[in-house]
């Protein structure tokens, strides 16, 4: 195991000004032991609402790299392979938890952060607003 | 703030048998301050690959509630509102980080865990395997 250095500038479990502090074992347990890592790797190309993946990188965050989906078209791909603007490609978003060092440069003190990521795109019927 | 009870059955930062233990502040910082909470709330109904949301609840996990998508159909909804089985509804999956109480029921001791969640569904062209 490791011993956590008592750096005076870094919080510890007795610090009443460091609210809701818990201890976390960073040995990640993987619950998805039988999943195929290539599971949905080509959906971004085969979808009627295809998307590109963009790298969002921040070395001070864990995970440092997050892949963000951006829909390729405003419309959706029809049976002829053309973009149909009567339908809309929209991103499916999810809030995920990430870790961030806080205060920065303290090796064993982190803060949970929620960020919104676009995971992929889906094709939806547009909401039509009728002018009265 | 809170004080962390010294429950003898729960590990603390000096416990050499609790590897890679760090302090994490659970006062979650939300980077998505300007996002609309209803952002994609009705996509599951309007999509050509609609899905149902199932509540996955586990009091020993943080977050304790995760909403899982299950595609409603094998095929996709066509312009006539019927299911077209020449296309496939497939789940878009993502691995996310969660915290799990470890040992169970210890209020301030967790382990990082990776789980695979289905966020929504998209409509894809099927892969056709030709028989030789």
């Amino acid at each position: 195991g490791i011993t956590i250095p008592r750096n005076p500038g870094c919080p510890n479990s007795e610090d009443k000004n460091f609210p809701r502090t818990v201890m976390v074992n960073l040995n990640i347990h993987n619950r998805n032991t039988n999943t195929n890592p290539k599971r949905s790797s080509d959906y971004y190309n085969r979808s009627t609402s295809p998307w590109n993946l963009h790298r969002n990188e921040d070395p001070e965050r864990y995970p440092s790299v997050i892949w963000e989906a951006q829909c390729r078209h405003l419309g959706c791909i029809n049976a002829d392979g053309n973009v149909d603007y009567h339908m809309n490609s929209v991103p499916i978003q999810q809030e995920i938890l990430v870790l961030r060092r806080e205060p920065p440069h303290c090796p064993n003190s982190f803060r949970l952060e929620k960020i919104l990521v676009s995971v992929g795109c889906t094709c939806v019927t547009p909401i039509v607003h009728h002018v009265q | 703030g809170i004080t962390i009870p010294r429950n003898p059955g729960c590990p603390n930062s000096e416990d050499k048998n609790f590897p890679r233990t760090v302090m994490v502040n659970l006062n979650i910082h939300n980077r998505n301050t300007n996002t609309n909470p209803k952002r994609s709330s009705d996509y599951y109904n309007r999509s050509t690959s609609p899905w149902n949301l199932h509540r996955n609840e586990d009091p020993e996990r943080y977050p304790s509630v995760i909403w899982e998508a299950q595609c409603r159909h094998l095929g996709c909804i066509n312009a006539d509102g019927n299911v077209d089985y020449h296309m496939n509804s497939v789940p878009i999956q993502q691995e996310i980080l969660v915290l799990r109480r470890e040992p169970p029921h210890c209020p301030n001791s967790f382990r990082l865990e990776k789980i695979l969640v289905s966020v929504g569904c998209t409509c894809v062209t099927p892969i056709v395997h030709h028989v030789q």
Partner: antibody
Framework: QVQLQQSGPGLVKPSQTLSLTCAIS??????????WGWIRQSPSRGLEWLGR?????????DYAVSVKSRITINPDTSKNQFSLQLNSVTPEDTAVYYC??????????????WGQGTLVTVSS | EIVLTQSPATLSLSPGERATLSCRAS???????LAWYQQKPGQAPRLLIY???NRATGIPARFSGSGSGTDFTLTISSLEPEDFAVYYC??????????FGQGTKVEIK
């Protein structure tokens, strides 16, 4: 099981281009869960990462600052291989060159499969 | 660029003894992106540990890793004859920052 097989000349003249190829079996160069990289090793520099390619709806190329102006890594999807080109070589580029698979889940990063290594000598 | 400094440069031990190898980073790195490799003469490096403490497939339990922040350790609990080799740590900070330590040679005393 995944294997990497390297090929290419062991002797290159100064100012010329070093070219090596790495053939992949048991995995795909366009896999979305891996990146494919080149690493070299010399007594003076130790192990030095040179660069990688990875495919995520398009090809991403990442190169070490030390060689950025001289390096190109290209995929060949038809042959399921990738190549290294290092231009304007000098005797300082003499090293054993390795290709490797970098496991590229966002949660971990490490090289789990390595090629056999190719000793490249830069000399006239 | 993050510099990884390994110590000692050489470790002279007998079979059955415990080996403790250190890897110190010039700035904080995520433990999840810290790996250890073993290299024998004329061979490519072989992955031992990833994520600072996870044993790679097929690696014996006598190898263990620990640490976080800037200080990481590889421990071989009881040296076997085949463990005498050079050991390297490696970090990934960003897509353009990936570095190796200079290595620790574990030799037979």
């Amino acid at each position: 099981q995944v294997q990497l097989q390297q090929s290419g000349p062991g002797l290159v003249k100064p100012s010329q281009t070093l070219s090596l190829t790495c053939a992949i079996s048991g995995d795909s160069v366009s896999s979305s869960s891996a990146a494919w990289g080149w690493i070299r090793q010399s007594p003076s520099r130790g192990l030095e990462w040179l660069g990688r390619i990875s495919y995520r709806s398009k090809w991403y190329n990442d190169y070490a600052v030390s060689v950025k102006s001289r390096i190109t890594i290209n995929p060949d999807t038809s042959k399921n291989q990738f190549s290294l080109q290092l231009n304007s070589v000098t005797p300082e580029d003499t090293a054993v060159y390795y290709c490797a698979r970098e496991v590229d889940s966002i949660y971990y990063s490490y090289f789990d499969i390595w090629g056999q290594g190719t000793l490249v000598t830069v000399s006239s | 660029e993050i510099v990884l400094t390994q110590s000692p440069a050489t470790l002279s031990l007998s079979p059955g003894e415990r080996a403790t190898l250190s890897c110190r980073a010039s700035q904080n790195v995520w433990a999840f992106y810290l790996a250890w490799y073993q290299q024998k003469p004329g061979q490519a490096p072989r992955l031992l540990i990833y994520g600072a403490s996870n044993r790679a497939t097929g690696i014996p339990a006598r190898f263990s890793g620990s640490g976080s922040g800037t200080d990481f350790t590889l421990t071989i609990s009881s040296l076997e004859p085949e463990d005498f080799a050079v050991y390297y740590c490696q970090q990934y900070r960003s897509t353009l920052s990936l570095t190796f330590g200079q290595g620790t040679k574990v030799e037979i005393k």
